[in-house]
């Protein structure tokens, strides 16, 4: 006799692990044999879907390899045309070992900001997430919290928060660990010890001291009156993320010295500044005609002639003393290209030492003129012919510019070392002895003011004149 379908074994909830097999059984008694269809979340499962196997006249539905997306309500419906269709439903719960779907990544963060290390997980049952810092479980506090999502949030990041982190996802089926990531805490550059201001005497040595810290360790640069420091020696040392910079200066003029500590955070820089003033005692004293200051020679023309690191007098009656005095020498040197090999080095030494006069120590900078004897040696011994020609040209007005006249000293207006050996500067490049003076032109005056005594020999000489040269 025909019999309406009856589901004798209703569907039950099935627990299945990912990639395992899950089977629903829908046992039906009926006559004639019913047609059985299956749905998942009310969507018909097609018979030809290769992910499923439907056997025993449709009474067995097997999911061949469970995926987490297979979760849902599965129903079987039986119908044989006799009476109404019958349905039974059951849930598939996909059980899953913990899986970290969005692992944490290395983070660089500036101290004081908020850091979030992500750790998004999957798993059924829902995994619990904890964090490890270094080798120890991370304890939550008012600043550090593990969010519902599993991410680690650190408010007001501190230097001590830096280190290696990993997240751990755990459920009843297993545990998953993320790879170890690094939290780097960067700290804005900060000056720990600012340079101190000094009031010193002209020609003193001063060491300015600047200490800074930061992560990464900052670099320190020194600025003098708004420009990069041009002279002085800088010594640096780094220890425990602290950089110590010492600028040693030879003080020849007042200045504002700024220590700038800089470090880089991604594409941005952080800087910290501290300044010190160097004032010179009695610097403001009126200087009348000898207005100027002393500084190390930074030009090119006189490099080989002037003593290394020597201080020279820069005359502030020029708008740009260094440039103006360099131009004076340059103009004069061009005239020297045609002079004899005996005259040229002597004349170069004279010009450079006359235009860039040596500085003497004291309360205010004062230039030291060349000794008359050395000037006369150049004029009447080394460059006798050339000097006559030059004087003749000057008298006849053959020079296009008057500039060269400023370059050539008037020997008679220079102090003699005979009367005061400390009143004037020697030219170390002129190295000759009394016997070399046998070719010296005869003197028209017996006064000591034009006498050339034996000039002191110099170990730093660049040339010497021997008696074999004829000066006539």
């Amino acid at each position: 006799l025909p019999k309406a379908p009856v589901i004798t074994t209703p569907l039950e909830t099935v627990d299945a692990l990912v990639e395992e097999v899950a089977t629903f059984m829908c046992a039906v008694e009926s006559y004639p044999q019913p047609e059985i269809s299956w749905t998942r979340n009310k969507i018909l499962i097609k018979l030809f879907d290769t992910r499923y196997s439907i056997r025993e006249n449709g009474q067995l539905l097997t999911i061949l390899s469970v995926e987490d997306s297979d979760d849902g309500i599965y129903c079987c419906t039986a119908n044989n045309g006799v009476g109404g269709a019958v349905e039974s439903c059951g849930a598939l719960q996909v059980k899953m070992k913990p899986k970290i779907t969005r692992p944490p990544i290395n983070v660089k963060i500036i101290e004081g900001l908020k850091a979030v290390l992500p750790c998004t997980t999957m798993g059924n049952p829902k995994p619990s997430v904890s964090w490890i810092k270094g080798d120890s479980p991370l304890r939550e506090n008012s600043r550090i919290a593990v969010l519902e999502s599993g991410s680690l949030r650190i408010h007001n990041v501190q230097k001590e928060d830096a280190g290696q982190y990993r997240c751990v996802a755990k459920n009843s089926l297993g545990t998953a660990y993320s790879k170890v990531v690094k939290l780097e805490v960067e700290v804005f550059a900060r000056i720990l010890r600012a340079p101190e201001s000094h009031n010193v005497t002209f020609g003193s040595f001063v060491t300015l001291h600047c200490t800074a810290t930061g992560i990464p360790v900052p670099t320190i640069t020194w600025i003098e009156n708004g420009n990069a420091v041009s002279s002085g020696s800088i010594q640096e040392s780094v220890k425990d993320r602290v950089i110590d910079s010492r600028l040693q200066l030879f003080i020849t003029k007042p200045g504002l010295y700024t220590c700038i500590a800089t470090n880089k955070h991604g594409e941005k820089f952080s800087t910290a500044k501290a300044a010190a003033t160097i004032s010179i005692a009695e610097w403001s004293k009126p200087q009348k005609d000898n207005k100027g200051y002393c500084a190390q020679y930074r030009g090119e023309v006189c490099n080989a002639v002037l003593a290394k690191d020597a201080l020279v007098f820069l005359n502030t009656s020029y708008a740009d003393p260094e440039e103006a005095q360099e131009l004076l020498v340059h103009t004069a040197w061009n005239e020297l290209k045609v002079v004899s090999p005996v005259c040229r080095p002597a004349a170069e030494a004279l010009l450079c030492n006359h235009i860039f006069q040596e500085c003497s120590p004291g309360v205010v900078p004062t230039p030291i003129p060349i000794c008359r004897e050395y000037c006369l040696a150049v004029k009447e011994l080394f460059c006798a012919k050339e000097w006559l020609v030059m004087e003749e040209k000057t008298h006849r007005g053959l020079y296009r510019s008057e500039m060269h006249l400023l370059s050539v000293p008037e020997c008679s207006k220079l102090p003699s070392m005979h009367w005061d050996p400390t009143a004037c500067a020697r030219l170390p490049h002129l190295d000759y002895n009394k016997e070399n003076l046998k070719t010296f032109p005869p003197m028209t005056s017996s006064k000591p003011s034009v006498d050339i005594p034996n000039l002191p020999s110099s170990s730093s000489s660049s040339f010497s004149v021997s008696p074999t040269y004829s000066m006539t």
């Epitope: 200087q287 690191d309 003497s360 207006k413 220079l414 003699s416 009367w419 005061d420 050996p421 009143a423």
Partner: antibody, heavy 115, light 113 residues
């Protein structure tokens, strides 16, 4: 030969003034720094003042504000004006040629401050 | 101000003897720009004006016998008479000329034995 001849010394009462002169010869006076140095009876040397070729002057603290150094390059003469004299200013006053060393010395002129 | 300290205050020597006089400055008198020490030595014989012997710590003034020599650097200096002669009996002074005021030492009296 360099000659430095001081004059103008003498006996003066405390609070009084004197003007010392030093006439230079034998060298181009205007090109050199000049100094005054004194020596109290039986005592050591005391540097007082220097004047450079541009007439910029420096003084020892003991005489600053009371003594004034000056020069006349036309007359080849160095001066020291002594004001508000005290008994401790009693000394032989030397005129000396020299920039950073006291190279040539005069014979000195005696200043006595006494009531 | 730079203070100059001389020692000893007095010394006696026989002819031919080596004599040294010391001078110390309270701060450096070495000028780094030219590496010169701005330290001078003077001799003052009884009843005479002082006479420059040594400038720049070691440069002998012209006419000064070569038995006189100066040495030292920065703050410590020495005047040496290699072979004392009777005419060397005098008071010797050191003086700094690094910066004004150019102070003298208190002097060392050198007498013949």
């Amino acid at each position: 030969e360099v000659q430095l001849v001081e004059s103008g010394g003498g006996l003066v009462q405390p609070g009084g003034s004197l003007s010392l002169s030093c006439v230079a010869s034998g060298f181009t006076f205007s090109l050199y720094y000049m100094n005054w140095v004194r020596q109290a009876p039986g005592k050591g040397l005391e540097w007082l003042s220097v004047i450079d070729t541009h007439s910029i002057a420096y003084y020892a603290d003991s005489v600053k504000g009371r003594f004034t150094i000056s020069r006349d390059n036309v007359k080849n003469t160095l001066y020291l004006q002594l004001n508000n004299l005290k008994p401790e200013d009693t000394a032989l006053y030397y005129c000396v040629l020299g920039r950073t060393a006291l190279v040539r010395w005069g014979q000195g002129t005696q200043v006595t401050v006494s009531s | 101000d730079i203070v100059m300290t001389q020692s000893p205050s007095s010394v006696t020597a026989s002819a031919g003897e080596r004599v040294t006089i010391n001078c110390r400055s309270s701060q450096s008198v070495l000028y780094s720009s030219n590496q010169k020490n701005y330290l001078n030595w003077y001799q003052q014989r009884l009843g005479q004006s002082p006479r420059l012997l040594i400038y720049w710590a070691s440069a002998r003034e012209s006419g000064v016998p070569d038995r006189f020599s100066g040495s030292g650097s920065t703050t410590n200096f020495t005047l040496t008479i290699s072979s004392f002669q009777p005419e060397d009996a005098a008071v010797y002074y050191c003086q700094q000329s690094y910066k004004p005021p150019y102070g003298f030492g208190s002097g060392t009296r050198l007498e013949i034995k």
